[in-house]
């Protein structure tokens, strides 16, 4: 516990100290006071730095005095011989005494007491700033007018926090500016302007004279500069050692001006000024700004339109332009957004045609349509080469975004016919030879193909049957074979408007107009052993001259049967009307000029006994083109014969090209279109 | 006179492989369908394969799918049977038929006899 | 697969009978049947096609008739040339085949 004073007597005193004593005594007066430690008697054993037995003061650390030998006072009025002042409110005396004494010695007598102590001036540290203060067992620190005392009770500052700035132009100057700056101060500026503003602070060099940095770099006094997470600064020095211009690129700044104890100059003045929040001019690339503008500021805005080819997608939905505003944070809105290259995405597939997988579905990508060859080739031109346009089609510089068009190659057999012997005198044939050859089954008969939804026959074939079931693709007909071959399901059947319907065919001596057509339900799938054939031309080219040849083929009536298993074919000249007329009616049914020969008909055969028979009808008469030596086209359909093994008629299918386009066209579905 | 003369039969081991030919005259070879037909020892007859006339369609019986490959070659108005992977069950004479038409074989060569023994 | 069952397997007869052989498929095979002759170590011959026609320089004594699975082939009066063994063969399918076969002879 704390005293105001005391007294400290050697062991024994006033008798001798003992040998081989260390005896410690710890002194300890109220905060705020000093110890004045007095002696009024010394009797100890003296020796060389009073190495045997000594009496020691120690405060703290620091040996204050080492005693021994005899004192006696020097003033006649004052019993003291030795005496300590010490600043400190504690201090430890330690007694020791060695093994053996010459003589018989005393010791010591001493007395402390609790002292004044001025921290003002007693200390070399200074403990107030400014002005300090003394009183009996303390101090306290004041300030000079204008200057507050801060928490610690020492420091004293100017009151030069707290001002809001929210004017969009200002200046601001450090206290007493250009008189020197307060020391020991730490001035806070705060400017607060509206959203979308910016900061920005001028200064001029001459306007700024802060306490230099020390010899590390640190500066002593500093002006700090804090925009959100941005500093500017510590600035300090004779002349702004900063940018002259500082664009904050936020609404809100700190100034923060923080000086020492020392060095004081006249400080620093600056201005600021709102700019509206600049956003960057951003390279988005791949499109447009309007309007272009060098800068700008919070509230522009401007459309952001693609390049062609080029398009901005948010969500499923793509567009080519948008919209962006300067922000107040001075970020543009929309920013994700992108102009992306256009994506055409997947082609669209074609019938009978594919497009290779393209690597890149992307603007200025190009893929390439083709027909299934060689069955089908691209009717609409354009070469099949499309590439991604700007409009996210895939385009064809003649189609345009039109598809291209698969249309089955017509008049080309996959193997050609090599002439044997049978039909009626013709030979066996493969359907790979005729693959437009069509069979029908009830009655027992033949047709030609055209196209993917058209069979071409006589009418005779289906006057009697307007639901006939056709085969293609099979070269023999046992049931077994067409189970395997493609079965056509008929749509309607268009029988010409000029041929005559009798009550009772059986005995029909008119084959005039003896052509029919039947639309299919659905679409025919080409391949080798099922292709059309070509319809003439309407030029002369496609006038038939004697002695021309031409293919027919079917599964009727042969030297050995009834009716054929296995296709049989056969080549035979084309002969003048007359010849027909010429051959006798084998079972006439009615008298032999009742029958009619018309310029609707063609005459062909009378070699080597090479003709079509019962169970032909409706195959076409198929003649090497004119003008396309590999191609067939259907010159006539196996229409009737006085005579099997003779000539037989066909109707001349020139003739009718105008009917037959007619109808389809007339009859067209729009999957077809 | 049509004529058909069958060869390249003979003694094979099983798993081995024989080629057979027949060489045909007296008639426009390429006008015409062939088939193989085979007869084992005292046994009746069994179709082995047909090729039409330009050689482009093929049919086989089940038993010798995949071993066997029928071809023509009407330039040297011949047809072959290609023999592979033969086993003791392919012990048969072999003959090379003509078809006259509508699967009707009209003329057949003496045939050659193929032995598939170890 | 079609198959076709011909009998009897054998048969023996007398100069100058009528000799009946049938032969039945196993499924609808309309008219698409062949009957074949083959005398001993001798190739086959056709004799009838399309079940009922009979081939060019066949003496009429052979007959043939029958549609769908139900087939016959007659020897109207059995001659010493005769003796053979009979095939049928169908061809409404692939693969096409033959029957088992009659053996005929004479007693």
């Known amino acids: 516990e704390p005293t105001m004073y005391g007294e400290i007597l050697s062991p024994n005193y006033p008798q001798a100290y003992p040998s081989e004593v260390e005896k410690s005594w710890d002194i300890e007066v109220p905060e705020g006071y000093g110890i004045h430690l007095y002696f009024t008697h010394l009797d100890i054993e003296l020796s060389e730095n009073c190495a045997y037995d000594s009496v020691q003061i120690i405060s703290g650390d620091t040996e204050e005095g080492r005693l021994c030998g005899q004192r006696s006072s020097n003033n006649p009025h004052s019993p003291i011989v030795e005496e300590f002042q010490v600043p400190y409110n504690k201090l430890q005396v330690i007694f020791k005494s060695d093994f053996s004494n010459e003589e018989r010695f005393t010791g010591f007598a001493a007395y402390y007491v609790a002292t004044d102590i001025n921290e003002c001036t007693d200390f070399v540290d200074v403990p107030c700033s400014h002005f300090c203060n003394n009183f009996i067992g303390g101090y306290f620190c004041s300030c000079p007018p204008e200057y507050f005392l801060h928490d610690d009770m020492k420091n004293c500052g100017v009151n030069c926090s707290g001002d809001v700035f929210t004017a969009l132009i200002g200046e601001i100057a450090s206290p007493n500016y250009p008189k020197p700056y307060p020391e020991n101060s730490r001035c806070e500026y705060q400017i607060r302007l509206e959203k979308g503003f910016q900061v920005v602070v001028t200064l001029r060099r001459e306007d700024f004279d802060v306490e230099a940095a020390d010899s590390a770099g640190n500066c002593l006094d500093s002006l700090v500069f804090v925009a959100g997470d941005r500093q500017f600064g510590p600035y300090c020095g004779h002349g702004f050692p900063g940018p002259l211009n500082i664009e904050t690129k936020s609404n809100a700044l700190d100034i923060i001006f923080q000086t020492d104890l020392t060095g004081q100059k006249k400080g620093w003045k600056l201005r600021y000024h709102g700019d509206p929040m600049p956003c960057p001019k951003e390279d988005t690339p791949n499109s447009v700004w309007e309007p272009a503008k060098a800068k700008y500021v919070f509230r522009d805005v401007v459309q952001i339109t693609c390049l062609d080819g080029f398009e901005v997608v948010e969500g499923r939905v793509g567009a080519t332009s948008f919209y962006s505003t300067c922000q107040s944070n001075g970020k543009w809105s929309n920013s994700k957004l992108k102009c992306q290259p256009v994506d055409c995405g997947i082609p669209e597939s074609i019938e009978n045609g594919k497009v290779e997988d393209p690597e890149s579905t992307l603007f200025g990508s190009v893929i390439r349509y083709t027909c299934e060859e060689p069955y089908y080739y691209m009717e609409n031109g354009g070469g099949g080469e499309y590439h991604c346009a700007g409009n996210g089609s895939w385009v064809n510089e003649v189609l345009g975004p039109e598809l291209p068009k698969c249309v089955p190659v017509c008049g080309v057999p996959r193997e050609p016919f090599e002439e044997k012997q049978r039909i009626i005198g013709g030979s066996d044939a493969d359907i790979k030879n005729f693959p437009w050859q069509v069979f029908f089954d009830n009655p027992w008969a033949g047709g030609a193909l055209i196209n993917e939804y058209w069979v071409l026959t006589a009418a005779h074939v289906v006057e009697g049957n307007r639901e006939p079931t056709m085969y293609v693709g099979s070269t023999s007909v046992q049931t077994s074979r067409l189970a395997k071959s493609k079965m056509l399901t008929p749509e309607h059947v268009f029988i010409h408007p000029g041929w005559k319907l009798l009550e009772v065919p059986e005995g029909r001596t008119n084959f005039d107009n003896d052509i029919a057509l039947v639309r299919l339900k659905d679409p025919v799938k080409m391949g080798p052993t099922v292709s059309p054939i070509c319809l003439p031309g309407t030029s002369s080219d496609y006038n038939l001259m004697d002695g021309d040849l031409g293919l027919i083929s079917g599964w009727g009536r042969t030297e050995k049967r009834d009716r054929a298993v296995r296709l049989k074919a056969a080549r035979l000249p084309v002969a003048p009307l007359r010849k027909c007329k010429e051959v006798k009616v084998e079972k006439p049914t009615a008298d032999a000029e009742a029958y009619v020969f018309t310029p609707n008909m063609i005459c062909a055969g009378g070699e080597k006994g090479m003709d079509s028979c019962k169970g032909d009808s409706g195959g076409a008469f198929a003649v090497q083109d004119p003008n396309d030596k590999t191609k067939f086209y259907a010159a006539g359909l196996v229409s009737w014969g006085p005579q099997c093994g003779t000539y037989g008629l066909y109707t001349r299918v020139k003739n009718y090209v105008d009917w037959i386009m007619k109808t389809m066209q007339e009859n067209s579905t729009p999957r077809e279109d | 006179e049509v004529q058909l003369v069958e060869s390249g039969g003979g003694l094979v081991k099983p798993g081995g492989s024989l080629r057979l030919s027949c060489a045909a005259s007296?008639?426009?070879?390429?006008?015409?369908?062939m088939s193989w037909i085979r007869q084992a020892p005292g046994k009746g007859l069994e179709w082995v394969s047909y090729?039409?006339?330009?050689?482009?369609?093929?049919y086989y019986a089940d038993s010798v799918k995949g071993r066997f490959t029928i071809s023509r070659d009407n330039a040297k108005n011949s047809l072959y049977l290609q023999m592979n992977s033969l086993r003791a069950e392919d012990t048969a004479v072999y003959y090379c038929?003509?078809?006259?038409?509508?699967?009707?074989?009209?003329?057949w060569g003496q045939g050659t006899l193929v032995t598939v023994s170890s | 697969d079609i198959q076709m069952t011909q009998s009897p397997s054998s048969l023996s007869a007398s100069v100058g009978d009528r000799v009946t052989i049938t032969c039945q498929a196993s499924?609808?095979?309309?008219?698409?049947l062949n009957w074949y002759q083959q005398k001993p170590g001798k190739a086959p011959k056709l004799l009838i096609y399309?079940?009922?026609n009979l081939e060019t320089g066949v003496p009429s004594r052979f007959s043939g008739s029958g549609s769908g699975t139900d087939f016959t082939f007659t020897i109207s009066s059995l001659q010493p040339e005769d003796i053979a063994t009979y095939y049928c063969?169908?061809?409404?399918?692939?693969?096409?085949?033959f029957g088992g076969g009659t053996k005929v002879e004479i007693k």
């Open positions: 007296g008639f426009t070879f390429s006008d015409y369908y």
């Open positions: 090729i039409s006339r330009s050689g482009s369609t093929k």
């Open positions: 499924q609808d095979i309309s008219n698409y």
């Open positions: 063969q169908q061809y409404e399918d692939y693969p096409l085949v």
């Open positions: 399309d079940a009922s």
């Open positions: 038929a003509r078809d006259e038409t509508d699967y009707a074989y009209d003329n």
